[in-house]
């Protein structure tokens, strides 16, 4: 599948920062999502996890961006082996982990899809 260019990764990082900066109230009313393995293929896995959160405007742009990074169509209820299916975490924690790892990839120039 297509590898996200560095500009697209920068935009994703910026959006993840936008929705977490100085944020103490639970994102998406404290919704829980499946944790994922932060490895190659993580963008599709992240989308598969976050797409199950509906009615949360704060993450809609992130969902759209991840759709652009994922080569196949993802729909609610769809799961890949990249999910750690025994662990659910809050959306805010999920976003923070995703941000941290995306920055790591960006710094090292490894734009994994």
């Amino acid at each position: 599948g297509p590898v996200p260019p560095s500009t697209a990764l920068r935009e994703l990082i910026e959006e993840l920062v936008n929705i977490t900066q100085n944020q103490k109230a639970p994102l998406c009313n404290g919704s829980m999502v499946w944790s994922i393995n932060l490895t190659a293929g993580m963008y599709c896995a992240a989308l598969e996890s976050l797409i199950n959160v509906s009615g949360c405007s704060a993450i809609e742009k992130t969902q759209r961006m991840l759709s652009g990074f994922c080569p196949h169509k993802v729909s609610a209820g769809q799961f890949s082996s990249l999910h750690v299916r025994d662990t659910k975490i809050e959306v805010a924690h999920f976003i923070t982990k995703l941000l941290s790892y995306t920055k790591q990839l960006f710094r090292h120039g490894q734009q994994f899809n």
Epitope: N22, Q23, L99, K103
Partner: antibody, heavy 126, light 109 residues
Framework: EVQLVESGGGLVKPGGSLRLSCAAS????????MSWVRQAPGKGLEWVGR??????????NYAAPVKGRFTISRDDSKNTLYLQMNSLRTEDTAVYYC?????????????????WGQGTTVTVSS | SYELTQPPSVSVSPGQTARITCSGD??????AYWYQQKSGQAPVLVIY???KRPSGIPERFSGSSSGTMATLTISGAQVEDEADYYC???????????FGGGTKLTVLG
């Protein structure tokens, strides 16, 4: 030693321009979000604006009174923050501080740490 | 534009508890930060993210937040705590910072 040192302040006429610099040392400047804060004589602290680290987008935000007149920039290769001030007004007279931005501390490696410069005085008067 | 409201002054006797409040509409969802500024000096962070204390700040300084109000508490105030205190936070977007008007703490010696 962790420190910020401002320079560039001085006396300028209304409508004039000035560029302040803030030299950082002792911490990873490139990872830090940085802010400018000012304090008019005998008044309280006023947030001027901030710049995110490059990795976090490098975007800038400004307070309404300075938006369109002031520009914050950074040069990570020189560990230096800048504040370009144009169309200066008498009400811009203040001590200007540069500081690590606490909102950005969450994303940098200075979480729970606080660094401010000693301040540089800007006087706008005819 | 977004504002944070603080009382202009608070007075306590040495050893008493001083409480300084800060109110703002976005505080239920955004963290508050507290700075101490002594005359002629740069501000010093005493509380971050509502209630966390930076290293080197005495334990008598604590912070809390409930609803639209953040509170800085100095338990057993000392003469050296006399200073101006400012709360700092952001608007609901998180993009724009704001300081409260400041509170002058007087510790009656």
């Amino acid at each position: 030693e962790v420190q910020l040192v401002e320079s560039g302040g001085g006396l300028v006429k209304p409508g004039g321009s000035l560029r302040l610099s803030c030299a950082a040392s002792g911490f990873t400047f490139s990872n830090a979000w940085m802010s400018w804060v000012r304090q008019a004589p005998g008044k309280g602290l006023e947030w001027v604006g901030r710049i995110r680290s490059e990795i976090d987008g490098g975007t800038t935000n400004y307070a309404a009174p300075v938006k369109g007149r002031f520009t914050i920039s950074r040069d990570d290769s020189k560990n230096t923050l800048y504040l370009q001030m144009n169309s200066l007004r008498t009400e811009d007279t203040a001590v200007y501080y540069c500081a690590t931005d606490q909102v950005g501390a969450y994303y940098g490696d200075y979480y729970g740490m606080d660094v401010w410069g000693q301040g540089t005085t800007v006087t706008v008067s005819s | 534009s977004y504002e944070l409201t603080q009382p202009p002054s608070v007075s306590v006797s040495p050893g008493q508890t001083a409480r300084i409040t800060c109110s703002g509409d976005a505080l239920p969802e955004k963290y508050a930060y507290w700075y101490q500024q002594k005359s002629g000096q740069a501000p010093v962070l005493v509380i971050y993210e509502d209630s966390k204390r930076p290293s080197g700040i005495p334990e008598r300084f604590s912070g809390s937040s409930s609803g639209t109000m953040a509170t800085l508490t100095i338990s057993g105030a000392q003469v050296e705590d006399e200073a101006d205190y400012y709360c700092h936070s952001t608007d609901s977007s998180g993009n724009h910072g704001v300081f409260g008007g400041g509170t002058k703490l007087t510790v009656l010696g």
